[in-house]
Structures are given as structure tokens and as C-alpha cells.
């Protein structure tokens, strides 16, 4: 069964996939595709890397992490409902039937309709001070407790830091990492 990830229409979706290169710079080809992982390759390929670089990508699909260190997590920009479905991450480890493959299910929810804030102070007061990160298992909610007033840029930065550090570690700890060599 597929691990499920969620995003809202208009957001960027994040689908995690990692491996540990045998040595720094000793990369393994990776492909991402729309549709469950078939026996070979990645269904309809949206992005791929080779031993050196990202060598094929389509619009809105990119790698935000350091793929040279094995973070081949996929970011899908500005998602729509049509982006819902299963995605395949395939680590194409050379050898006899060595590939590792992961099916990730992306669920896109309609965007929440919220009234436009009249003043920055009102927005800050109404902000729920809560961020959700998606790990390898059920979604975890991180409550940020009592915070000073923060603006959208700070929220975005905080979310990125939370995702990049905490989530990456959680994912690696939960067995979503493939070690090579």
C-alpha cells in the first residue's frame, strides 16, 4: 500500500525519497513518475537524474533537496486537483534486480477559502500557530506554542526549516532511506 501525502490546491507538494550514496558524489540514477512503480522505470517519467545531474525534468517538478547527498524528494509546484494520484520514486541501483521503488500517494484538497485580513495585526492574532509536516507515516502536527507576531516570510522560513531538518531526520529514521554500498 502507498504512503499518503497531502497538499492543498495552489501549494507546493512534497514527496520524500532518500538514499545514501556509497560515497560522496557516487550517485545512482533516480526517476520519478506519475503512476505506481512498474517493473522497470517510472511509468510516465516527470523527472530523472543520472550519475551526475538532473538530466530530465518537466515543468513544475523539481528536486528541492541536495540530490548529490541522496535527497531526491520531489517538489510539485502549485498543485491542482489533477495532480492527485500515485507517484513512483525509483532508485536505479546497478546490478541484477537491485532497484528500490516507492509508491507515494498524493491527495490534493481544495484550497481553504479564507476572508482576506484587513490588517496585519488581525492576521497575526487569527493565525493558528500550527504547522503540519508530513512524515513517512500519518501526518504529524507540530504546535508552535506561544510565538511573537510573525509575518508570512517568517512562517515560510520556519516551515522550510522544520521540514528540512525535522522531517528529513524523521524520514531517515523511519526507514525511508536506502543505503547503497
Amino acid at each position: 500500500s502507498e504512503v499518503e501525502y497531502r497538499a492543498e490546491v495552489g501549494q507546493n507538494a512534497y514527496l520524500p525519497c532518500f538514499y545514501t550514496p556509497a560515497a560522496p558524489g557516487n550517485l545512482v540514477p533516480v526517476c520519478w513518475g506519475k503512476g505506481a512503480c512498474p517493473v522497470f522505470e517510472c511509468g510516465n517519467v516527470v523527472l530523472r537524474t543520472d550519475e551526475r545531474d538532473v538530466n530530465y525534468w518537466t515543468s513544475r517538478y523539481w528536486l528541492n533537496g541536495d540530490f548529490r547527498k541522496g535527497d531526491v524528494s520531489l517538489t510539485i509546484e502549485n498543485v491542482t486537483l489533477a495532480d492527485s494520484g500515485i507517484y513512483c520514486c525509483r532508485i536505479q541501483i546497478p546490478g541484477i534486480m537491485n532497484d528500490e521503488k516507492f509508491n507515494l500517494k498524493l491527495v490534493i484538497k481544495p484550497a481553504k477559502v479564507t476572508p482576506a485580513p484587513t490588517r496585519q495585526r488581525d492576521f497575526t492574532a487569527a493565525f493558528p500557530r500550527m504547522l503540519t509536516t508530513r512524515g513517512h507515516g500519518p501526518a504529524e502536527t507540530q504546535t508552535l506554542g506561544s510565538l511573537p507576531d510573525i509575518n508570512l516570510t517568517q512562517i515560510s522560513t520556519l516551515a522550510n526549516e522544520l521540514r528540512d531538518s525535522r522531517l528529513a531526520n524523521d524520514l531517515r529514521d523511519s526507514g525511508a532511506t536506502i543505503r547503497i554500498g
Partner: antibody, heavy 122, light 107 residues
Framework: EVQLVESGGGLVQPGGSLRLSCAAS????????MAWVRQAPGKGLEWVAN????????YYLDSLKSRFTISRDNAKNSLYLQMNSLRAEDTAVYYC???????????????WGQGTLVTVSS | DIQMTQSPSSLSASVGDRVTITCRAS??????LAWYQQKPGKAPQLLVY???TLAEGVPSRFSGSGSGTDFTLTISSLQPEDFATYYC?????????FGQGTKLEIK
């Protein structure tokens, strides 16, 4: 026009070896996975092995992987199947087939060679 | 291994008939299914891939449908050249596996 032409089949004794070749033309050979599929006389189709674009990854029917080796030479647009320790049950027509391409999408053996007959008998 | 079971094993029909062949996978293969036609002494020919996409040059009287575990190949109006053996094949799990074949004969 896509063409796949197999060669190397013939009569071989049990325990013997044979190397099949498949010459490809009419497409960019290095952009496709390639496969061998066999068909015993009067029987159905059986997948034997696949190889990725550059030959770095190979895939086999479990019961054959200790005796058969698939390989390719992209410079020569050629696919090979080395068959060792042959048995009577390996008697079949062996087909070379073009599989999925670099961008995925089309999952099926789109083109086949005419086949080469391998007969294992004493 | 994923088992592919075709039915019927053989079928007698007449020119102009509508014919349906079914293929059942022992596990979910999504839409990674292909159909082939084979005539005696010839190599198989791809008819349909990804369960429902018609291969290049295949007449429109052939169509494929289904996903998951149950699939069908339909010939809307049988022509004399359609009498042959038909195979389904999955491209989802290793090893790749074929159905046992359906022999379509003239009634």
C-alpha cells in the same frame, strides 16, 4: 523502420552453451530497455530477461539467472543472451523484443524479432 | 509472482462477431497490461499497452479496458485475419508474466 534480427540459435547438447544475438536498427537503441522472451514448441510465451539502457541493470526469470546472462553493446546496436548449462526444457524459439523507452509511458513489447530456434537435445 | 489467467482458453466465432477475451491478474497491476496477437510461425504483435492504449497501426476494432486485476480485450467485428492466439501480459511485477493464451478459431 524498426527491425530486430536474432541469430545464434541451433542444436546444442544438454550442458552446452549458446550465445544469441539481436541486431537492432531503425531506432535509437540506447533509449530503450530490451528483452528476451521465449516460446517452447506449442506452448505460451515466457519472459526470460530484460536489460536497461546502458546495461548496468539486468532482470531475470529467477529460475534462469544462474545460467543465462543478458547484455548489450550500444555501439553495435546489439543485444545478447549467453545461455550456459542448457537443458532440454530450454528448447524454444527465442525472441528479442524492444521494451519501455527512456521516458516511460508505453509498457509493452512494441517490436519483436522473427525469433531464433534453440534446440537442446542429445 | 503475479499470475495472469485468461478466459476462455479457446473460442469459436464467426466473421462479424463481437468477441471479448478476459484476463485476470492475481494481484493489482494498475494499468500495466498489454495484449498481443500471435499467428502460427510468427512473432507476437502488440495490440494494446497500458491496458487501453491502441498500439500504432492496430485497427480500431480492437480495444482494451480494465485496471487493477480485471482486464478485457474486445474485437468489435471479427475479421478473417483476426483468427489467432491472444496473450495478455503484465508489466508491473517481476517476473513479467503472460497469460496462457486464448485461441480464437473460426466457427
Amino acid at each position: 523502420e524498426v527491425q530486430l534480427v536474432e541469430s545464434g540459435g541451433g542444436l546444442v547438447q544438454p550442458g552446452g552453451s549458446l550465445r544469441l544475438s539481436c541486431a537492432a536498427s531503425g531506432f535509437t537503441f540506447s533509449d530503450y530497455y530490451m528483452a528476451w522472451v521465449r516460446q517452447a514448441p506449442g506452448k505460451g510465451l515466457e519472459w526470460v530477461a530484460n536489460i536497461n539502457y546502458d546495461g548496468s541493470s539486468t532482470y531475470y526469470l529467477d529460475s534462469l539467472k544462474s545460467r543465462f546472462t543478458i547484455s548489450r553493446d550500444n555501439a553495435k546496436n546489439s543485444l545478447y543472451l549467453q545461455m550456459n548449462s542448457l537443458r532440454a526444457e530450454d528448447t524454444a524459439v527465442y525472441y528479442c523484443a524492444r521494451d519501455v523507452g527512456y521516458y516511460g509511458g508505453n509498457y509493452g513489447f512494441a517490436y519483436w524479432g522473427q525469433g531464433t530456434l534453440v534446440t537442446v537435445s542429445s | 509472482d503475479i499470475q495472469m489467467t485468461q478466459s476462455p482458453s479457446s473460442l469459436s466465432a464467426s466473421v462479424g462477431d463481437r468477441v471479448t477475451i478476459t484476463c485476470r491478474a492475481s494481484d493489482n497491476i494498475y494499468s500495466y497490461l498489454a495484449w498481443y496477437q500471435q499467428k502460427p510461425g510468427k512473432a507476437p504483435q502488440l495490440l494494446v499497452y497500458n491496458a487501453k492504449t491502441l498500439a500504432e497501426g492496430v485497427p480500431s476494432r480492437f480495444s482494451g479496458s480494465g485496471s487493477g486485476t480485471d482486464f478485457t480485450l474486445t474485437i468489435s467485428s471479427l475479421q478473417p485475419e483476426d483468427f489467432a492466439t491472444y496473450y495478455c501480459q503484465q508489466h508491473y511485477g517481476s517476473p513479467l508474466t503472460f497469460g496462457q493464451g486464448t485461441k480464437l478459431e473460426i466457427k
